[in-house]
Amino acid sequence: THLGIRLPLRSGLAGPPLGLRLPRETDEESEEPGRRGSFVEMVDNLRGKSGQGYYVEMTVGSPPQTLNILVDTGSSNFAVGAAPHPFLHRYYQRQLSSTYRDLRKGVYVPYTQGKWEGELGTDLVSIPHGPNVTVRANIAAITESDKFFINGSNWEGILGLAYAEIARPDDSLEPFFDSLVKQTHIPNIFSLQLCGAGFPLNQTEALASVGGSMIIGGIDHSLYTGRLWYTPIRREWYYEVIIVRVEINGQDLKMDCKEYNYDKSIVDSGTTNLRLPKKVFEAAVKSIKAASSTEKFPDGFWLGEQLVCWQAGTTPWNIFPVISLYLMGEVTNQSFRITILPQQYLRPVEDVATSQDDCYKFAVSQSSTGTVMGAVIMEGFYVVFDRARKRIGFAVSACHVHDEFRTAAVEGPFVTADMEDCGYNIPQTDESTLMTGRA
């Protein structure tokens, strides 16, 4: 659904001290498009609260109106609250902007649960902690919504960073990032470092914490360790990729790899969980249960509903397995794997038991629309959306939560044959892009 599972996330604190960072394995600067090295002004420009989304500050209109905007790589509309709503502290007031232009067209976006609708226009947009540019972009002014805005989330709109093919009402509405690249000299690349908290945050900490970084126009080397590994973007609509193998604690799930990508696999910062197709989810949970069988957890925990609590500081991370996804590599018959820890897929939940407890939700869930690599995956990695070269890069995030025994990993190469067969070909119908629920 749009709420909870669909709209994410966890706020986070800055990463470990530099002393805990691993040395760089290779220097890949020659391979990287765009500006290289340091993007100091963009580091730590994201904030977030557990399960409620990572947002960036943006300004719209003239004079500029400041809004917090959810960063969503799983959609393609720039849409902002433009009318009073009980959950909004502020909203876009078009009548106060001298540069607003009405496109005289409506837009309606239904989700499996909830919806938003609004009026299309254009206005001047900038990102204060981003590149020093102002662009004219399409804006959907949300006038009505249901179960879209989240009480206390602190964001007032959504920045869809995916491709025009899934824009609403149709692919003629140019997404924000396309406008940005067209109107400036900014390279066609952005990267995200989402920093999960790893422990429940109280209200004060959550509001004060840094959530991560959105680097527009390049790659910041301070945000990752080791090397970047790239997987092709299969098709430019969602950020679609191909998973070729799944392992739980090194044990292959041994499924036909088409199942892993049925009906697609996407990288989506606007989803909290790692979401897996039904058959894959069932096999993965069975394997995770077996690996953690020294303890038993309630049925509702594995459904992502019940919370499990341990005395503060005693969470038995060691009994939970690591999850590895093998992604198609850039070279024929070559793949690489990304490995996440329970520190990523057990999501801390605040304010439910006592302050003496650490409580978690299981953040792997079932999907009817394919694999969704949401925050649970992204919080382990620095993720590079290299649109110019139609590829997505993964490296171990400098801020990922881990312990003294295990760390998230990006490793390769591995020899994997017939990876093209792992992709699922969706039957083309006029209705195919109407499934925005991501339930």
């Epitope: 020294t294 957890f297 309630p298 049925d299 509903e305 019940q306 609590c309």
Partner: antibody, heavy 120, light 108 residues
Framework: QLQLQESGPGLVKPSETLSLTCTVS??????????WGWIRQPPGKGLEWIGS???????YYNPSLKSRVTISVDTSKNQFSLKLSSVTAADTAVYYC????????????WGRGTLVTVSS | EIVLTQSPATLSLSPGERATLSCRAS??????LAWYQQKPGQAPRLLIY???NRATGIPARFSGSGSGTDFTLTISSLEPEDFAVYYC??????????FGGGTKVEIK
Amino acid sequence: QLQLQESGPGLVKPSETLSLTCTVSGGSISSSSYYWGWIRQPPGKGLEWIGSIYYSGSTYYNPSLKSRVTISVDTSKNQFSLKLSSVTAADTAVYYCARVGHGISYFDLWGRGTLVTVSS
Amino acid sequence: EIVLTQSPATLSLSPGERATLSCRASQSVSSYLAWYQQKPGQAPRLLIYDASNRATGIPARFSGSGSGTDFTLTISSLEPEDFAVYYCQQAYVWPPRTFGGGTKVEIK
């Protein structure tokens, strides 16, 4: 059918350790479908969860009692036990053992309970 | 910490009447809530689990409803053996640990 029976001294002196055992009959304590728990009820008052244990020995305790509680399991005897140290009069209660079933979320089967009085 | 508040503390009714007992959680517990019946000198007995499912052997006159923060136990027509204390318990936060303070259903 499965039954639970608490046993142990009915009188414990202040500052000593309360020890109770729950014997499971008519079924195996080693079932992977259940946890086993202790709950107490002071006279005329409500129910208070003390802690739970899995047959593997994995334990969970009420944070307010954790420093004084130990729950253990003996699968060979089909029993689990409670030890509560440094008792005071406030620990006087009926102590129940129970099975945690229905998705290991609810206390679906209870022993009859045993009254433990803390007094010198 | 999730606190369960039961109301009323005491309910005075006659046999054959309908009893409605309330349990309110300080924050959402989804549908992970149970009801227990305890008669004097006896152990509690599970009546309802997951807010609305009757446990094995529980008569149909007992029903549970609600989700989120507000839950109700209804006894459609009180039998003499139904006069007892009723407790709710949440299992949203696991391990199950929190009981309500109880509602006493007494004969009017």
